[in-house]
């Protein structure tokens, strides 16, 4: 892979010196480094009207390196790019730009959304939920005996949480009234609902669920702030009820 010099041979600057600073193999007073020691990258830095050669162990931000047989050279990425694979393909954009297919954009194209952590344009992800689980046994105040009219609940899982612009999740709990033949509670029988039905409450902000309306079946679009307020109100209600030592099945 030896370099075969073309018609335009590069002429050395008249003031070429061998006593060079940090990493330079050859240098001149006027242009700085002209060539580098092995494994170092040669980069031209513009200082005013002058271009100064510098030798570095790796290319600086906004440059990419090419290891030619006779020289390791840094080449500038496009102006809006911080890290690039080559002139055509950016891999990390400068602040304020979003990366999409190797290009840096002010805004993400239609159908994509900006990920403000990675600063990339990503596909919009919509909520996905599982099928409904079977209805729970008919209960009243947490008991399965000693009443005629109670409520039953069914749940479904969130399979895919939505991204910022994705469709919100529909309700994951549904409660309805139920009627059973009254059955006397046996002595000491509390008849509480099975523990396996208890679901861990999602962490704050973990699931983007829409709160159902009074029918408990339709989802409504709402802002994160509204959702946060409702969750706080719900927590307070639950705490109040716990103080009154009444266990009720609620709609999430």
């Amino acid at each position: 892979q030896n370099a075969s010099r073309g018609r335009r041979q590069r002429r050395m600057h008249p003031n070429v010196s061998q006593g060079c600073q940090g990493g330079c193999a050859t240098c001149s007073d006027y242009n700085g480094c002209l060539s580098c020691k092995p494994r170092l990258f040669f980069v031209l830095e513009r200082i005013g009207m002058k271009q100064i050669g510098v030798c570095l162990s790796s290319c600086p931000s906004g440059y990419y390196g090419t290891r030619y047989p006779d020289i390791n050279k840094c080449t500038k990425c496009k102006a809006d790019c911080d890290t690039c694979f080559n002139k055509n393909f950016c891999t990390k954009c400068k602040s304020g730009f979003y990366l999409h297919l190797g290009k840096c954009l002010d805004n993400c194209p239609e159908g994509l959304e900006a990920n403000n952590h990675t600063m990339e344009c990503v596909n919009i992800v919509h909520c996905e939920v599982s099928e409904w689980n079977p209805w729970s046994p008919c209960t009243k105040k947490g008991k399965t005996c000693g009443f005629k009219r109670g409520t039953e609940t069914r749940v479904r899982e969130i399979m895919q949480h939505p991204s910022a612009k994705g469709n919100l999740c529909p309700p994951t709990n549904e409660t309805r009234k139920c009627t059973v033949q009254r059955k006397k509670c046996q002595k000491g029988e509390r008849g509480k609902k099975g523990r396996e039905r208890k679901r861990k409450k999602p962490n704050k902000g973990e699931s983007k669920e829409a709160i159902p309306d009074s029918k408990g079946l339709e989802s409504s679009k709402e802002t994160p702030e509204q959702r946060e307020n409702k969750q706080q109100q719900k927590k307070r209600k639950v705490q109040d009820k716990q103080q009154k030592s009444v266990s009720v099945s609620t709609v999430h």
């Epitope: 010099r5 073309g6 018609r7 335009r8 290891r67 694979f85 393909f89 891999t91």
Partner: antibody, heavy 116, light 107 residues
């Protein structure tokens, strides 16, 4: 739209010469290192030569060094490959490509057959 | 020169099947790695650069992974238009070297 169009291929006898040309359009030719990559019939890809953006340096694969020369005319956005002392093993489709670490743009290729 | 060992040499897959092609490199090249697709009678086209980044227009069923000396190309759900030869290339240093290629056919 980027276009690279090769020409100058054909049938040539061993030991003879051939010059390939590649006309480029749709991108800033003078910004890019340009290369020739070849592919023998039913075989893989082999890098032949690269000339840097300003034409001042060129690099060659072991199998062609000393026999092939590469040049460019940035005013005409054209790349050339001068092939001398051709051998039967030089028989291949020759592709003109923009070489910037990866080979980003490719021409349609031109067939060179070296046979007596 | 950096050696590229690509496997398998050929592969046939059914429609919708997931396929993987691997490339082993003789020295650590970080992620300076590229995949090309060459359809029959056509010139190669850049598919993936920097080991895992898709070129514009490449369907999302294609994905690249790996770093250092081991790289792979995955097609999640083979389509008729994916029938082609695939080549890997190291872009770490001169001379640029290619894998021998993998011919992917539709069963």
């Amino acid at each position: 739209e980027v276009q690279l169009v090769e020409s100058g291929g054909g049938l040539v006898q061993p030991g003879r010469s051939l010059k390939l040309s590649c006309a480029a359009s749709g991108f800033t030719f003078s910004d890019y290192d340009m290369a020739w990559v070849r592919q023998a019939p039913k075989k893989g890809l082999e890098w032949v030569a690269t000339i840097i953006y300003d034409g001042s340096r060129a690099y060659f694969g072991d199998s062609v060094r000393g026999r092939f020369t590469v040049s460019r005319d940035n005013t005409k956005s054209t790349l050339y490959l001068q092939m001398d002392s051709l051998r039967s093993e030089d028989t291949a489709t020759y592709y003109c490509t923009a070489h910037d670490r990866s080979f980003d743009y490719w021409g349609q290729g031109v067939m060179v057959t070296v046979s007596s | 020169d950096i050696q590229m060992t690509q496997s398998p040499a050929s592969l046939s897959a059914s429609l919708g099947e997931t396929v993987s092609i691997e490339c082993l490199v003789s020295e650590d090249i970080s992620n300076d790695f590229v995949w090309y697709q060459q359809k029959s009678g056509k010139s190669p086209q850049l598919l993936i650069y920097a080991a895992s980044r898709l070129q514009d227009g490449v369907p999302s069923r294609f994905s690249g992974s790996g770093s250092g000396t081991r790289f792979s190309l995955r097609i999640s759900g083979m389509q008729p238009e994916d029938e082609a030869e695939y080549f890997c290339q190291q872009s770490y240093k001169y001379p640029p070297t290619f894998g021998a290629g993998t011919k992917l056919e539709l069963k």
